[in-house]
């Protein structure tokens, strides 16, 4: 049940990431740690790296408010279930600084890929016989 709540939150975050991708030119073009090909059991650690990253609005044009609201939603902490498990994995997973830094567009694409990977793992774990490769 707790894990389900997490994954539902991940699905909502995908929509927010997709919205932010539309405003990528209005984001500060800063390079941010962007985990990719995250090893098994380090997904939550990588997720927290994405949340900690200083994604910022460039404060230009009419989109500043919607961008700031979306960034705030991305950074909202998930429910505290499994927090202990996440903490345990963090000890053996790469530090945020060790991940390759990418500009906002690639940062958001990698964040989305991680969210999708986590949801897919969750979906597959509840199912038998449809995974092909």
């Amino acid at each position: 049940q707790g894990q389900d709540r997490h994954m539902i939150r991940m699905r909502q975050l995908i929509d927010i990431v997709d919205q932010l991708k539309n405003y990528v030119n209005d984001l500060v073009p800063e390079f941010l740690p962007a985990p990719e090909d995250v090893e098994t059991n380090c997904e939550w650690s990588a997720f927290s790296c994405f949340q900690k990253a200083q994604l910022k609005s460039a404060n230009t044009g009419n989109n500043e408010r919607i961008i700031n609201v979306s960034i705030k939603k991305l950074k909202r902490k998930p429910p505290s279930t499994n927090a202990g498990r996440r903490q345990k994995h963090r000890l053996t997973c790469p530090s945020c600084d060790s991940y390759e830094k990418k500009p906002p567009k690639e940062f958001l694409e990698r964040f989305k890929s991680l969210l999708q990977k986590m949801i897919h793992q969750h979906l597959s774990s509840r199912t038998h016989g449809s995974e092909d490769s």
Partner: antibody, heavy 117, light 107 residues
Framework: QVQLQESGPGLVKPSETLSLTCTVS????????WGWIRQPPGKGLEWIGY???????NYNPSLKSRVTISVDTSRNQFSLKLSSVTAADTAVYYC???????????WGQGTLVTVSS | DIQLTQSPSSVSASVGDRVTITCRAS??????LAWYQHKPGKAPKLLIY???SLQSGVPSRFSGSGSGTDFTLTISSLQPEDFATYYC?????????FGGGTKVEIK
């Protein structure tokens, strides 16, 4: 805005292989999940399967032995092959994108495939 | 496989009416349910995901609720462009499955 367009023969003979292609525009096929859903005449929607940006596939167990979904990133296309078709495979076939992994946010308009000799 | 049963199978309503469609799952699916609108010859359109989240660009007159096995799609004030068939889909486990559809017709 992502747009999808199905293409392929509208008529396939029994026991042959149905082949459809979905062309994606307005977005890259190198991310997200790309699926096929069908609707036989007068019936409901049936998920056939999908392929991820990384190439991993999931198929409906009821069709798994006959289905292959593949992706061609250079052409921004993905394809469906359904072997050994029968009249029961007559349907409107839709291709769709799944950003959320398990729901479909963009669909093609569908193409009718009739299986008949 | 998880079966989804939609009711009613069709409903006649007028512009401005409040329309409610229900979807019942054969087993608990938490909030993993999506709703689609489908018009003949057109591409189906995602309205709601994870039971109650409104897809970007969808009018706020559409809302979804429920969890576990019982779910509802509500159109608060039916508009002329809302006459269509609506489908629910479970996103909880493979194979992904759809409900049988509810046709919303003009009274």
């Amino acid at each position: 805005q992502v747009q999808l367009q199905e293409s392929g023969p509208g008529l396939v003979k029994p026991s042959e292989t149905l082949s459809l292609t979905c062309t994606v525009s307005g977005g890259s096929i190198s991310s997200d999940y790309w699926g096929w859903i069908r609707q036989p005449p007068g019936k409901g929607l049936e998920w056939i399967g999908y392929i991820s940006y990384s190439g991993s596939t999931n198929y409906n167990p009821s069709l798994k032995s006959r289905v292959t979904i593949s992706v061609d990133t250079s052409r921004n296309q993905f394809s469906l092959k359904l072997s050994s078709v029968t009249a029961a495979d007559t349907a409107v076939y839709y291709c769709a994108r799944s950003a959320g992994v398990a729901d479909f946010d963009f669909w093609g308009q569908g193409t009718l495939v009739t299986v008949s000799s | 496989d998880i079966q989804l049963t939609q009711s009613p199978s069709s409903v006649s309503a007028s512009v401005g009416d409040r329309v409610t469609i229900t979807c019942r799952a054969s087993q608990g699916i938490s909030s993993w349910l999506a709703w689609y609108q489908h018009k003949p010859g057109k591409a189906p359109k995602l309205l709601i995901y994870v039971a109650s989240s409104l897809q970007s660009g969808v009018p706020s007159r559409f809302s979804g609720s429920g969890s576990g096995t019982d779910f509802t799609l509500t159109i608060s004030s039916l508009q002329p462009e809302d006459f269509a068939t609506y489908y629910c889909q479970q996103a909880s486990s493979f194979p992904l499955t759809f409900g049988g559809g509810t046709k919303v017709e003009i009274k």
